[in-house]
Interface confidence: low
């Protein structure tokens, strides 16, 4: 069974996938819909890289920009370096600016909800 | 509601250029792809690429690379394709299509297309 | 490049029947598959995505289904404005492409 045929088996489940089940389907060509990704857990979504947010959700990365200002995508934009978030081309900003240090304080971010930011 | 203008016509001779124009409405111009769709007359349709308007990056199919180059001015929110070097192959109806439904790059609104008639 | 098969160029169908336009995907597509109407003269308009989903405003006798590599736009309750052409299209991956057309035709 090859990736296109496992989302649609598994699409219905994956509203409470963890991370590790989002990086494994981001190498099977999948290209995940938007809706369905925007129904998944946040918590799962931000630890995702820019290349495999690309990857999961192939020619759908698209509608990123257009649900910019909404969770998990908000969230998740907040997290990447902006220079990653300029290489898909969709203008989406928001990202950690260049040249600052993320230090990744779990304790800090479940208090503020944003990552801790040193700058350069 | 979306809207998007296209001048009906155009008659050019071979080996010239043209670009055409795609003038959008009612939605956020910037936000999301605008896709270029090629049709010869009682053939089928053909995808040239698409551009972010926000920042002007692109996609091209590998066969309209040479072809076609597509551009943006943000202030009138229009859309641009030029073709160069024209030969009949190039006679076609030229169709603009935003990306701009529930995050899906099916084409959900269409321009009503220009005709180009490349004779001598 | 994924090629979009619709094998059958023409079909005639009577007012009132029911037909099935057939896409096949040259590889799995999943469900990224969107369907289109276009009449003579006119702009393609937008009746299926992701497989199954109609776009607002379309007419419930059109029904989208499929996934993998072949795909069914089924027409119910044929009424003659519904004399176009069809295609389907992937979005699967890039670059996007169509398939070549079914002409629907009204006895």
């Known amino acids: 069974m090859n990736g296109s045929e496992y989302f649609v088996k598994i699409q219905s489940f994956l509203g409470g996938a963890p991370t590790e089940d989002l990086k494994a389907l981001s190498q099977q060509n999948v290209s995940m819909d938007l809706a369905t990704f925007m129904k998944l857990r946040t918590d799962a979504v931000l630890p995702l890289t820019v290349a495999e947010v690309q990857k999961l959700l192939g020619p759908h990365v698209e509608g990123l920009k257009a649900e910019e200002r909404h969770r998990p995508v908000r969230d998740w934009i907040l997290r990447q370096r902006q220079d990653d978030l300029d290489t898909l081309g969709l203008g989406l900003q928001g990202g950690i600016p260049n040249g600052y240090l993320v230090l990744d304080l779990s304790m800090q971010e479940a208090l503020s909800g944003t990552p801790c930011l040193l700058g350069p | 509601q979306v809207q998007l203008q296209q001048p009906g016509t155009e008659l050019v001779k071979p080996g010239a250029s043209v670009k055409l124009s795609c003038k959008a409405s009612g939605y956020t111009f910037t936000s999301y792809w605008m896709h270029w769709v090629k049709q010869r007359p009682g053939q089928g349709l053909e995808w040239i690429g698409n551009i972010i308007p926000s920042n002007g990056g692109t996609k091209y199919n590998e066969k309209f690379k040479s072809k076609a180059t597509l551009t943006v001015d943000k202030s009138s929110s229009t859309a641009y394709m030029q073709l160069s070097s024209l030969t009949s192959e190039d006679s076609a109806v030229y169709y603009c299509s935003p990306h701009y439904y529930g995050g899906s790059p099916g084409f959900a609104y269409w321009g009503q297309g220009t005709l180009i008639t490349v004779s001598a | 490049d994924i090629v979009m098969t619709q094998s059958q160029k023409f079909m005639s169908t009577s007012v009132g029947d029911r037909v099935s336009v057939i896409c096949k995907a040259s590889q799995n597509v999943g469900t990224n598959v969107a369907w289109y109407q276009q009449k003579p003269g006119q702009s393609p308009k937008a009746l299926i995505y992701?497989?199954?989903y109609r776009y607002s405003g379309v007419p419930d006798r059109f029904t989208g289904s499929g996934s993998g590599t072949d795909f069914t736009l089924t027409i119910s309750n044929v009424q003659s404005e519904d004399l176009a052409e069809y295609f389907c299209?992937?979005?699967?991956?890039?670059?996007?492409?169509f398939g070549g057309g079914t002409k629907l035709e009204i006895k």
């Open positions: 299209q992937q979005y699967n991956s890039y670059p996007l492409t």
């Open positions: 992701s497989a199954s």
